[in-house]
Amino acid sequence: VPRWRQQWSGPGTTKRFPETVLARCVKYTEIHPEMRHVDCQSVWDAFKGAFISKHPCNITEEDYQPLMKLGTQTVPCNKILLWSRIKDLAHQFTQVQRDMFTLEDTLLGYLADDLTWCGEFNTSKINYQSCPDWRKDCSNNPVSVFWKTVSRRFAEAACDVVHVMLNGSRSKIFDKNSTFGSVEVHNLQPEKVQTLEAWVIHGGREDSRDLCQDPTIKELESIISKRNIQFSCKNIYRPDKFLQCVKNPEDSSCTSEI
């Protein structure tokens, strides 16, 4: 008799998930000498251990601690770029500005970027059919808890001036329900972080509005100021310029030194 399987509202685990995670880990540790000591098989085992055989609506940050320990990484704390609803452009930016880092430029972020995964209670199977949706099913699912955990740790590590890239084309430029708004903002450490500088990226090429006056940016400023962190906002008008050096990263003028 076929075993009854919970049908969730979200897409199932990304196909070839174990192979993808392992391959990404190997690639990352080859490219980043400071992470060469990492044993990728152990990383996969820890990743798997966080969600396999567990109810996918009952995952905790504690479940991911073995993985967090193995993936411990030091990035320059004053070179952190956070982002919200504008991932691709943020990643294009750090591909050029190699001394700045998004979460997805770290090992753990790189492993999980754009992937979905979940298991089933009391079986060692990975569920490739469906996984819980954050809104429709439950928030304590494997993917959401993973990103909440790594995002919190990433924000806690930040120091000096922290940058965040925001999408000026969205109705809510700052969304307090986003990972940035609900996790990262509240885990910046006032004793280490002097300023949060928001880059509001304009979409339209003829756009000359001052989006730093947007009510949601004022809301962000209020939250940050109450946490005793200075706030700065800059309008950024030509996002196509981010591609200037993507095609020609060897151009010496594309480095952080001008």
Epitope: V96, Q97, D240, S253
Partner: antibody, heavy 120, light 107 residues
Framework: QVQLVESGGGLVQPGGSLRLSCAAS????????MNWVRQAPGKGLEWVSA????????YYADSVKGRFTISRDNSKNTLYLQMNSLRAEDTAVYYC?????????????WGQGTLVTVSS | DIELTQPPSVSVAPGQTARISCSGD??????VYWYQQKPGQAPVLVIY???KRPSGIPERFSGSNSGNTATLTISGTQAEDEADYYC??????????FGGGTKLTVL
């Protein structure tokens, strides 16, 4: 090292035309916005026009809109400014300037300039 | 369009600190750039992104931007710093503007 060399300036009568060129070297020309900035004798700097990396997007100051046309030839590493219906107030040194990368919109490098004199 | 206002002239004794202001509505929301221009020469970028110094520019040049005012500060001013200084910003579309310029005189 980055070099920008302007040419094509000279004396022209009001209502006349002139085409300025800027030869670029020392960087990947096709990766940068390029600009023209001018300076009338004894006056301050005035931005004139900008063009995107691929030449698709063009921007003009109100004072020259409809009269000046910016263009570029990435295969020749050259920037152009076609100036029509010239007026006495267009008399200035015209500089070619390369944009800063990424989030910055300022001028990292400038040519030495070419003088345009509009007079009868 | 934003308008940038600079004092026409600033005087400073050698070794002292010179401060040149540049004001405009909500200027803090835009990156500001500063250029030095000596007679008969092309402008040279001395500060970009409010406070960053291009390589080759002496450490005595610094910049800040808050409220409606950006400031170029030259600490321990030298005779060779005598020049015209221009601030500049970009507010989108075709709105790239320069301040009127400030003549710095080293007494």
């Amino acid at each position: 090292q980055v070099q920008l060399v302007e040419s094509g300036g000279g004396l022209v009568q009001p209502g006349g035309s002139l085409r300025l060129s800027c030869a670029a070297s020392g960087f990947t020309f096709s990766s940068y916005y390029m600009n023209w900035v001018r300076q009338a004798p004894g006056k301050g700097l005035e931005w004139v026009s900008a063009i995107s990396m691929d030449g698709v997007y063009k921007y003009y100051a109100d004072s020259v809109k409809g009269r000046f046309t910016i263009s570029r030839d990435n295969s020749k590493n050259t920037l152009y400014l076609q100036m029509n219906s010239l007026r006495a107030e267009d008399t200035a040194v015209y500089y070619c300037a390369r944009d800063l990368p990424l989030v910055y919109t300022g001028f990292a490098y400038w040519g030495q300039g070419t003088l345009v004199t509009v007079s009868s | 369009d934003i308008e940038l206002t600079q004092p026409p002239s600033v005087s400073v004794a050698p070794g002292q600190t010179a401060r040149i202001s540049c004001s405009g509505d909500n200027l803090r929301h835009y990156y500001v750039y500063w250029y030095q221009q000596k007679p008969g020469q092309a402008p040279v970028l001395v500060i970009y992104g409010d406070s960053k110094r291009p390589s080759g520019i002496p450490e005595r040049f610094s910049g800040s931007n808050s409220g409606n005012t950006a400031t170029l500060t030259i600490s321990g001013t030298q005779a060779e710093d005598e020049a015209d200084y221009y601030c500049q910003t970009y507010t989108g579309g075709a709105s790239l503007v320069f301040g009127g310029g400030t003549k710095l005189t080293v007494l």
